[in-house]
Interface confidence: low
């Protein structure tokens, strides 16, 4: 008879699971030289060890500690980007703006990037039929707890200007729901960060509004201005020229605005 | 262990071209960089551009950039650094220098190959 | 371009002294890197941003500094130390190198 296993709202976990987090951590340190020290068999273990046995919506900060003390990392504190809704132009950016960094950047965000996962209760085996939706289920679920802490300690570390990208596309610019605006933002310390300065990527081409008047805009504004933090806000209205100008900033085009 | 071979030294007349390959082993060509610097007798460092073999992308300084042509051949782990309009200036020993991208030094230098420009 | 000049060009040290060297860049940089040359030798990474020392660099090695000025400091000098030192900034297109510092023995 086969056993009953819970049928969660949300997709299993990621195919291949272990072996994507093991390549991904053999793929980092081979790249990264302040990283070579990392053994990726105890990473693993660390990151088995957070989910596994454990019931899916009980997950806390505490079981994912082992990992996180792997995965310490030092990135230039003032070289911090954050993003919403709007990973792919971050990510292209540190590409290209070498001493940038994302969460996706560090050795944790690169391992969980787009992978979900789940265990169930008192058993050793990964659920690759269904994990816990955020909304539907519950929200102390294995990624949902992983991302809220690591996005918690990467934005603790940073200092003097923190960047954060947002998707001027969207009709919250700024959404307090959103792992920056209900984790990033809370967790920015005053006496390191100067100032958060916000870069509105605009959609359309022809778009030349002042998306830095947005509500939402002025909302994150008066957050960040309560927590004793300077704002400001750029409009990007042209985000394939942003990314050109960040790879040839002495291109004649590039004085103008972007 | 990682290693950069290059090709071997060149004697050019002005206005030939010359090019350079790189051949990489001991780690995985498309997860680095690659840049190309000179070094002409008794002068400093000079970086000329990069790539990303994994894209083809290609940064130039530009200073070389309508005489400096960077490519890659991904299945053989090589990378190329062509240098046309050679002037007796461009005499200089040519290093490929592999990069890892986020905010580290080149790590590892090919040996260098010589280039000599005289008529 | 950023022109970055290093300072003195030749130290002249007995091994056991402190070395500092200095490099100075026309506009403000984010982190500056350093490489070790030996005679007929390609350059070796030694410093990365700023203060990191690279893979098999001695603890005696340190790097400061910010905006437009940066240093290498050798605590005591050993045998293996005497070389050229080169500072090199990633932060604008094209990246530059020092002129050197050539550390010679006295």
């Known amino acids: 008879v086969p056993r009953w296993r819970q049928q969660w709202s949300g997709p299993g976990t990621t195919k291949r699971f272990p072996e994507t987090v093991l390549a991904r951590c053999v793929k980092y340190t081979e790249i990264h030289p302040e990283m070579r020290h990392v053994d990726c068999q105890s990473v693993w273990d660390a990151f088995k060890g957070a989910f596994i046995s454990k019931h899916p919506c009980n997950i806390t900060e505490e079981d994912y500690q082992p990992l996180m003390k792997l995965g310490t990392q030092t990135v230039p504190c003032n070289k911090i980007l954050l993003w919403s809704r709007i990973k792919d132009l971050a990510h292209q950016f540190t590409q290209v703006q070498r001493d940038m960094f994302t969460l996706e950047d560090t050795l944790l965000g690169y391992l969980a990037d787009d992978l979900t996962w789940c265990g169930e209760f008192n058993t050793s085996k990964i659920n690759y039929q269904s994990c816990p939706d955020w909304r539907k289920d519950c929200s102390n679920n294995p990624v949902s707890v992983f991302w809220k802490t690591v996005s918690r300690r990467f934005a603790e570390a940073a200092c003097d200007v923190v960047h954060v990208m947002l998707n001027g596309s969207r009709s919250k610019i700024f959404d307090k729901n959103s792992t920056f605006g209900s984790v990033e933002v809370h967790n920015l310390q005053p006496e390191k960060v100067q100032t958060l300065e916000a870069w509105v990527i605009h959609g359309g081409r022809e778009d030349s509004r002042d998306l830095c008047q947005d509500p939402t805009i002025k909302e994150l504004e008066s957050i960040i201005s309560k927590r004793n933090i300077q704002f400001s806000c750029k409009n990007i209205y042209r985000p394939d020229k942003f990314l050109q100008c960040v790879k040839n900033p002495e291109d004649s085009s590039c004085t103008s605005e972007i | 262990q990682v290693q950069l071979v290059q090709s071997g030294a060149e004697v050019k007349k002005p206005g030939a071209s010359v090019k350079v390959s790189c051949k990489a082993s001991?780690?995985?060509?498309?997860?680095?960089?690659m840049n190309w610097v000179r070094q002409a007798p008794g002068q400093r460092l000079e970086w000329m551009g990069y790539?990303?073999?994994?894209?083809?992308?290609?940064e130039y300084n530009q200073k070389f950039k309508d005489r400096v042509t960077i490519t890659r051949d991904t299945s053989a782990s090589t990378a190329y650094m062509e240098l046309s309009s050679l002037r007796s200036e461009d005499t200089a020993v040519y290093y490929c220098?592999?990069?890892?991208?986020?905010?580290?030094?080149?790590?590892?230098w090919g040996q260098g190959t010589t280039v000599t420009v005289s008529s | 371009q950023i022109v970055l000049t290093q300072s003195p060009a030749t130290l002249s040290l007995s091994p056991g002294e402190r070395a500092t060297l200095t490099c100075s860049a026309s506009?403000?940089?984010?982190?500056m890197y350093w490489y070790q040359q030996k005679p007929g030798q390609a350059p070796r990474p030694w410093i990365y941003?700023?203060?990191n020392l690279a893979s098999g660099v001695p603890a005696r090695f340190s790097g400061s500094g910010s905006g437009t000025s940066y240093t290498l400091t050798i605590s005591s000098l050993e045998p293996e130390d005497f070389a050229v030192y080169y500072c090199?900034?990633?932060?604008?297109?094209?990246?530059?190198f020092g002129q050197g510092t050539k550390v010679e023995i006295k």
């Open positions: 941003l700023t203060s």
């Open positions: 220098a592999r990069y890892p991208y986020r905010g580290y030094a080149m790590d590892y």
């Open positions: 001991g780690y995985t060509f498309t997860n680095y960089w």
């Open positions: 506009s403000s940089v984010s982190y």
């Open positions: 790539i990303i073999p994994s894209t083809d992308y290609t």
């Open positions: 090199q900034q990633w932060s604008t297109n094209p990246w530059t």
